[in-house]
């Protein structure tokens, strides 16, 4: 199939994770194809390693792309003492890599 | 110093064919996928086409499969796009692009771009 660009969304925690002490961010990567696409998280623009996590869908049966959700976990303490979180996502569909963000408190 | 320099862009009726060459200098060649981006006036660039470094693997834009071929020669440090069948829609500036991880499209290296006018 032809190649196509990811479409890139990305999540606050809910309220009612933040209640349980936790904070997962999330950046969804909706319907690319080839399969290879990098995401990056940066957290006041401060590139983290290691505390996220991938999951890739298998390909869609009726138009043969994937998806993939990339999951940033923090503590709820260590969430709210940063302000800006982004997601930044390259893929060879893409001439330069799209950057997904929020200002905590601000959604 | 990386170097990407396009060539074979020109003024070419509808129908008809052009072939394309972009030559790297000072860049190690294996292990680089090499792609192919256009960018029309008042447009986005846009994704043409992308050949892996193995040269086994290549990817095509929608409007690009069936009429254009990507294709490399890793000796010479070059890679082509011939494009048949041209349509005036394909009327942009043709960049070639560097993706030393070969995956990721972490286009590191661009050509300054040729020009690809089809009249109609």
């Known amino acids: 199939r032809t190649v196509a660009a990811p479409s890139v969304f990305i999540f606050p925690p809910s309220d009612e994770q933040l209640k349980s002490g936790t904070a997962s961010v999330v950046c969804l990567l909706n319907n690319f194809y080839p399969r290879e696409a990098k995401v990056q998280w940066k957290v006041d623009n401060a590139l983290q390693s290691g505390n996220s996590q991938e999951s890739v869908t298998e390909q869609d049966s009726k138009d043969s792309t994937y998806s993939l959700s990339s999951t940033l976990t923090l503590s709820k303490a260590d969430y709210e003492k940063h302000k800006v979180y982004a997601c930044e996502v390259t893929h060879q569909g893409l001439s330069s890599p799209v950057t997904k963000s929020f200002n905590r408190g601000e959604c | 110093q990386v170097q990407l320099q396009e060539s074979g862009g020109g003024l070419v009726q509808a129908g008809g064919s052009l072939r394309l060459s972009c030559e790297a200098t000072g860049l190690t060649f294996s292990g680089v996928a090499m792609a192919w981006f256009r960018q029309a006036p008042g447009k986005e660039r846009e994704f043409v086409a992308i050949i892996r470094w193995s040269g086994s693997t290549t990817y095509y834009s929608d409007s690009a499969k069936g009429r254009f071929t990507i294709s490399r020669d890793n000796a010479k440090n070059t890679v082509y796009l011939q494009m048949n069948s041209l349509k005036p829609e394909d009327t942009a500036v043709y960049y070639c692009?560097?993706?030393?991880?070969?995956?990721?499209?972490?286009?590191?290296?661009w050509g300054r771009g040729t020009q690809v006018t089809v009249s109609s």
């Open positions: 692009a560097a993706d030393p991880s070969d995956r990721f499209g972490e286009y590191d290296y």
